[in-house]
């Protein structure tokens, strides 16, 4: 003989894979103080249960460590924990009370769980900048991840020279000392949930600030292709009268600020021009000698210096009108 | 010191043609580009172009092809602009800039010449 | 053709006070920016190359900043000699072009 009662609270739960839940229950308030039995939490359909404190009784195979009775007749507790939470757990549970003693038990309503699939993704937080040679320690994160659940697997990829820190049931820590190189390319985080077979990841583009490692002038004159310096250079010649383009490139994180200088300027010096172009719309002999190039970042300072050398074809000056 | 001198006033009727000079002084004149600046009256500047001093080669910005032209006479070191088939529209004061070294900004103006285009 | 824009097309001021002339392009010019004085009747004077360089013999009150597309020329302490007009202009990309120009004027 059996006698129902309602499970209180929702009719269905629902729980992302590799996560726990509680399935809520409270044995009904009718039931004698004095009796005294076991209680089986039963998937609809199976007569082997999922999870009970009765220690003479099988539990299904699918379902054993990580269904937990949580059992406290005194507060009448009967409720379940799920932990682990895998896509073949959904499914619609009941919980009974059996008493060898008593010619009576008790069978509840049933409750739906259903499993959908992880949505949470790791978190990577990083301490504010990330700057070229200097250690910094990443953390990637699953704060949504239950304590009772089997510790999740961390790992991580990146191209940059790493090493890992210490970890904890719901984040791993990541010392990078980047280099300029790496600015720009991928650090991964991956968890993976081995209770559930998930696995989880979080992709983050590095932004490694550096200072100008090369520094290059472009030189446009009259309407003759470009031609690229990359180190200091002495006397290039330029004809006179012609115009003359001066494009200045550097790397660098955050942009290096580019001016152009007359000379070898000091570091107080006033630019000729405040950006990394310098206008020559004509050249002339009274201005050959040196112009410099002076990427300026924070982190360090690059400069590079071009000596022009004018010459002219004695065809070339305009006449009389 | 460094000067440019321009020619004086000038009151024209629409079609008749007119030529503005401005002598420069004081710096090497093939050096250094010499632009024309137009100022209507009441009305901000319009930069119309500009003659390379060494070459003799004018540039013209789009309002300014046609009717216009640069001209040099670098034994005199003067620059010219030529004004055809004169419109009402070209009354305004025309300035000789000229050309910065380093870039295409303008550090010595003339003092302007005014034009007058009226029947 | 890149727009230099002067919104204020007046200013009024009185003498000591620090005044802003703004100027926005209508596009990126870098740092290509100048500044010049026009006093009435007369031609306008160089003030400020590559957005903030002072020109020579330009006296220290006059500064510029800026660059992109919005540059501001400022006079920290005005004179009574500085009443006159301010035009901006682009060198960046031909053609080059200047602002419509803000009058100073005392209050």
């Known amino acids: 003989q059996e006698r129902r009662f309602q499970l209180e609270g929702p009719e269905s739960l629902t729980v992302q894979e590799g996560l726990c839940v509680l399935v809520p229950c409270r044995l009904p308030t009718t039931l004698p103080a004095s009796y005294y039995g076991y209680g089986y939490w039963f998937l609809e359909g199976a007569d082997v249960p999922v999870a009970t404190n009765d220690p003479d009784e099988e539990v299904q195979e699918e379902t054993r460590g990580r269904f937990h009775l949580l059992w406290d007749p005194r507060r009448k507790n009967c409720s379940l924990s799920i932990r682990d939470a895998r896509r073949r757990d959904n499914a619609a549970y009941f919980f009974r009370l059996k008493s060898k003693w008593m010619k009576y038990g008790y069978t509840s309503s049933k409750l739906s769980v259903r499993v959908m699939a992880l949505t949470h993704r790791p978190n990577i937080s990083i301490p504010g900048t990330l700057e070229s040679g200097h250690p910094s320690n990443l953390t990637c994160s699953v704060p949504w991840v239950c304590e009772q659940g089997t510790p999740p697997i961390f790992s991580w990829m990146s191209a940059a020279p790493t090493s890992l820190g210490p970890r904890t049931t719901q984040s791993s820590v990541l010392t990078i000392t980047p280099r300029p190189q790496d600015h720009s390319t991928n650090l991964t985080c991956q968890v993976t949930f081995p209770g559930a077979g998930v696995t989880m990841e979080r992709t983050i583009q590095l932004n490694v600030s550096y200072a100008p490692q090369k520094v290059a002038i472009s030189i446009f004159q009259g309407n003759s292709a470009a031609f690229k310096i990359l180190q200091n250079t002495s006397s290039l010649p330029v004809l006179e009268g012609q115009a003359l383009r001066l494009l200045c490139d550097a790397d660098g994180n955050p942009p290096a600020h580019l001016s152009w200088f007359q000379g070898f300027p000091a570091l107080n010096a006033t630019p000729i021009s405040n950006t990394g172009v310098l206008e020559l719309p004509q050249v002339g002999s009274a201005e050959e000698g040196d112009f410099t190039c002076r990427a300026q970042h924070p982190l360090g300072s690059l400069q590079i210096s071009l000596s022009l050398f004018v010459h002219w074809k004695p065809e070339g000056r305009a006449g009389g009108v | 010191q460094i000067q440019l001198v321009q020619s004086g006033p000038e009151l024209k009727k629409p079609g008749e043609t007119v030529k503005i000079s401005c002598k420069a002084s004081g710096y090497t004149f093939t050096t250094y580009g010499m632009s024309w600046v137009k100022q209507a009256p009441g009305k901000g500047l319009k930069w119309m172009g500009w003659i390379n001093t060494y070459s003799g080669v004018p540039t013209y910005a789009d309002d300014f092809k046609g009717r216009f032209a640069f001209s040099l006479e670098t034994s005199a070191t003067t620059a010219y602009l030529q004004i055809n088939n004169l419109k009402n529209e070209d009354t305004a004061t025309y300035f000789c800039?000229?050309?910065?070294?380093?870039?295409?900004?303008?550090?010595?103006w003339g003092q302007g010449t005014t034009l007058t285009v009226s029947s | 053709d890149i727009v230099m824009t002067q919104s204020q097309k007046f200013m009024s001021t009185t003498v000591g006070d620090r005044v802003s002339f703004t100027c926005k392009a209508s596009q990126n010019v870098g740092s290509a920016v100048a500044w010049y004085q026009q006093k009435p009747g007369q031609s306008p004077k160089l003030l400020i190359y590559?957005?903030?360089n002072r020109y020579t013999g330009v006296p220290d009150r006059f500064t510029g900043s800026g660059s992109g597309t919005d540059f501001t020329l400022t006079i920290s302490n005005m004179q009574s000699e500085d009443l006159a007009d301010y035009f901006c202009?682009?060198?960046?990309?031909?053609?080059?072009?200047f602002g419509g120009g803000t009058k100073l004027e005392i209050k």
């Open positions: 202009q682009q060198y960046s990309s031909y053609p080059y072009t």
């Open positions: 800039a000229r050309l910065a070294y380093f870039g295409y900004y303008f550090d010595f």
């Open positions: 590559s957005a903030s």
